[in-house]
């Protein structure tokens, strides 16, 4: 029985050419997290963070992308392409597979604020 | 700490059968996909067999397919392989491998954590 | 089944000096390449898995490179406890998963 919760950092907006943190917080579940992979909306795989081997960034992705904070990812050098789903997916077990859902928006405006809330999505 | 302990080697005459076993560790066995790999006296590595998390799904190489048998028993802890119609060229070490991955992220294929060994002989 | 090449056989290096490992497939494997240490009676180690990406607790005066089927495995400045044995593993998503013949790094 699947008991625990995905908390994300819901919607959020950053400035073009800044950064941003995704983050996904899995709660209310004593399962343990094998693999957590982070997908961006067209579901390429941006980076995996596997228990035993650590970090995996895409190549793709390994000039834009670090690792962390925590089991979070931080998306650097943003361009207006960058908006959209992201997808955080907990391989857990024995619970099975949790996702969350991020929305990012990157704004052309200097006033663009990164809220940084979690919320249940 | 994740711990692989072989046993069941030894010296064996050709045609005969051995069972290999793996005792886990130091980690949740039941999720993980598991492999058994060889290596020759002063030879190169090979891969011999892998089994899923549940042990549902097996893959063999060529070279062991309907003489080696893996399996596991999740309750115990504990990864086998059966070995009949054994040939001189069965002669290895065994190591039992860890595979990082599970039933829900996908297998890898490959070993972070190994056993240390054992011996089998085949040999007349 | 694809065959690993490793060359050379055997490379001899002075500590602190740069080493260069080379392997190649009979066939396209993308990324989905590792590589092993081995030292004597010892179990191997994993190295490198993707090409590219270090293992946790991997030093990073080791890394990897290539796809499809040419893949190098650099050790920047060899130190005394990477004398030993190097081999490369595909891991296609379909068995069987195979291993080159390996490359002896040895003291010169």
């Known amino acids: 029985m699947m008991t625990g919760t995905i908390e994300t950092t819901g919607n959020i907006s950053a400035k073009k050419g800044g950064s941003v943190i995704l983050q996904c917080h899995l709660s209310s579940t004593m399962a343990q997290v094998t693999q957590v992979n982070w997908e961006q909306h067209d579901h390429s795989l941006l980076a995996i963070r596997n228990a035993e081997l650590g970090w995996h960034i895409y190549p793709a992705f390994k000039d834009r992308v670090a690792p962390g904070p925590g089991l979070g990812l931080t998306l650097q050098s943003l361009t207006m392409n960058d908006t959209g789903e992201y997808f955080c997916t907990y391989h857990t077990y024995p619970d099975g597979t949790y996702r969350g859902r991020i929305f990012l928006e990157v704004l052309e405006s200097s006033v663009a604020e990164h809220s940084a809330r979690f919320q249940i999505p | 700490e994740v711990q692989l302990l072989e046993s069941g080697g030894g010296l064996v005459q050709p045609g005969g059968s051995l069972r290999l076993s793996c005792a886990a560790s130091g980690f949740t066995f039941g999720p993980y996909g598991m492999s058994w790999v060889r290596q020759a006296p002063g030879k190169g590595l090979e891969w011999v067999s892998a089994?899923?998390?549940?042990?549902?799904?097996?893959w063999y190489a060529d070279s062991v397919k309907g003489r080696f048998t893996i399996s596991r028993d999740n309750s115990k802890n504990t990864l086998y392989l059966q070995m009949n119609s054994l040939r001189a060229e069965d002669t290895a070490v065994y190591y039992c491998?860890?595979?990082?991955?599970?039933?829900?992220?996908?297998?890898?294929?490959?070993?972070?954590?190994w056993g240390q060994g054992t011996l089998v002989t085949v040999s007349s | 089944e694809i065959v690993m090449t490793q060359s050379p056989a055997t490379l001899s290096v002075s500590p602190g000096e740069r080493a260069t490992l080379s392997c190649r497939a009979s066939?396209?494997?993308?990324?989905?390449l590792a590589w092993y240490q081995q030292k004597p009676g010892q179990a191997p180690r994993l190295l490198i898995y993707s090409a590219s990406t270090r293992a946790t607790g991997i030093p990073a005066r080791f890394s990897g490179s290539g796809s499809g089927t040419e893949f190098t495995l650099t050790i920047s400045s060899l130190q005394s406890e990477d004398f030993a044995v190097y081999y490369c593993q595909q891991y296609v998503p379909h068995p069987p998963f195979t291993f080159g013949g390996g490359t002896k790094v040895e003291i010169k």
């Open positions: 089994i899923s998390g549940s042990g549902a799904s097996t």
């Open positions: 066939q396209s494997v993308s990324s989905n």
């Open positions: 491998a860890k595979d990082p991955g599970t039933h829900y992220s996908g297998y890898y294929y490959i070993w972070r954590y």
